[in-house]
């Protein structure tokens, strides 16, 4: 009996750029002798419902269709059929297909390969043309895929002790496409700091597919106006 | 990290004060607000007031106005919260709380006190 | 002051189960609400602020809905570590208010 076993879930994430792995375990209840067994690699792309082929090995032969394209030879050996491919880009997110042939046996197994760009965030304060004491913060995300993305504002007072999201004069942009396939997109914050408490935080939240945890960049109002910081990880309510 | 050490268990009667104290470290202690709960045993929580840590404001609950004293001591990063004229139903574990960053808010360990004839 | 109205006080279910706490507000108290959850002899830890937000750490199975009057806490499939009590409070004035707590027992 022979089985091919997939990254569980059907779903395989992945970073933009990384060496990424992508699983296939081969169950065969003989030792597996490479010598005799094939294994081919396909890739179908998001766009087109055209299957294209990888990768392949067959006894003493191997062949990458994809530059870098890899299987292990060693691994294969204790049924490790994965293939690794460097510098994953976002255009070979898809549907990839192990293929195993013990002859006269021949398994299968599907995964779904999601390549995701983690989004850079910055915060800028732009005040020209803002009348006295109105200010505009600007959060920047870019380079960010897919394009789904949730910015946030919030603010924490000194005496509360937790945050509250602003929703009023707050202003998202459009997501532009880059050149590269990623995205971008700014968020504005519109602030009269005369009717702010000095001391109070004010913090940009960057929510993505890509993120463990969001992306945070603060600014603290304090008597003499603002300090901005850019932080991706600190004590941000500091 | 982040810190709030508070002091020991106590032991009070009738009619008695508790001091009861915070330290904190970890953090600019003067740029904020410290607040105080308490929790009876098996009940819920419930706020007393809070002091702001550079010593020049707080807000009490108006349940407790009269009988509690929040004061700071910047020099040690110390809070302090004192309640007088105890009676059975203050016996609770009292805790200090600082304003949170993205894990959530600060609480000490809690200090139990015990108000017993 | 403004009261926190929770319920149930109590909740029996099992592993795996999907739960959900809910807290009145006695007036409108926007998003300016907190959820803790309160393991036996420790502090109280915050899982979720202004009504719907998860703190960094928090698992995902932990979800916060509501504004205004009505909030709840749902916890998608519960994990023998749940089984615990937890609190509401609201944070939009003193003085803060907090619910009774519901206890989430085993089955």
């Known amino acids: 009996d022979l089985k091919v076993e997939m990254m569980a879930g059907g779903t395989q994430i992945t970073p933009l750029n990384d060496n990424v792995t992508i699983f296939c375990n081969i169950f065969y209840s003989q030792p597996l002798n490479i010598t005799s067994m094939g294994i081919t690699w396909f890739w179908k792309s998001l766009t087109f419902d055209k299957e294209v082929k990888v990768f392949e090995f067959f006894g003493d032969h191997q062949e990458a269709f994809r530059p870098g394209a890899i299987v292990s030879p060693w691994r294969l050996k204790s049924g490790d059929a994965s293939l690794r491919l460097p510098g994953i880009q976002l255009e070979e997110a898809g549907e990839y297909r192990c293929e195993v042939v013990v002859t006269p046996l021949k398994a299968q197994g599907t995964v779904q390969l999601e390549v995701v760009a983690s989004p850079a965030s910055r915060l800028l304060l732009d005040q020209v043309g803002m009348k006295e004491n109105e200010d505009k913060y600007m959060c920047e995300s870019s380079g960010f895929y897919p394009e789904a993305i949730n910015i946030t504002w919030e603010k924490q007072t000194q005496k509360f002790p937790h945050p509250i999201e602003i929703s009023e004069d707050v202003i998202t942009g459009p997501t532009i496409k880059n050149m590269d396939g990623t995205f971008n997109v700014t968020s504005c914050l519109k602030l009269n700091s005369s009717q702010e408490d000095p001391g109070t935080v004010y913090q940009c939240v960057v929510r993505h597919a890509s993120l463990h945890t969001p992306l945070r960049s603060n600014f603290t109002l304090t008597a003499a106006r603002h300090s901005l910081s850019e932080t991706e990880k600190t004590d941000n309510f500091s | 990290q982040v810190q709030l050490v508070q002091s020991g268990a106590e032991v009070k009667k009738p009619g008695a004060s508790v001091k009861v104290s915070c330290k904190a470290s970890?953090?600019?202690?003067?740029?904020?607000?410290m607040n105080w709960m308490r929790q009876a045993p098996g009940q819920g929580l419930e706020w007393m007031g809070g002091i702001y840590l550079s010593g020049d404001s707080t807000d009490y609950n108006e349940k407790f106005k009269g009988r509690v004293t929040m004061t700071v001591d910047t020099s040690t990063s110390t809070v302090y919260m004192e309640l007088s004229s105890l009676r059975s139903e203050d016996t609770a574990v009292y805790y200090c709380t600082r304003r949170g960053d993205y894990f959530g808010d600060f609480w000490g360990q809690g200090t139990l006190v015990t108000v017993s004839s | 002051d403004i009261q926190m109205t929770q319920s149930p006080s109590s909740l029996s279910a099992s592993v795996g189960d999907r739960v959900t706490i809910t807290c009145k507000a006695s007036q409108n108290v926007g998003k300016y609400v907190a959820w803790y959850q309160q393991k036996p002899g420790k502090a109280p830890k915050s899982l979720i602020y202004s009504a719907s937000n998860r703190y960094d750490g928090v698992p995902s199975r932990f979800s916060g809905s509501g504004s205004g009057t009505d909030f709840t806490l749902t916890i998608s499939s519960l994990q023998p570590e749940d089984f615990t009590t937890y609190y509401c409070?609201?944070?939009?004035?003193?003085?803060?208010?907090f619910g009774a707590g519901t206890k989430l027992e085993i089955k």
């Open positions: 409070q609201q944070y939009i004035s003193y003085p803060l208010t």
């Open positions: 970890g953090y600019t202690f003067t740029s904020y607000w």
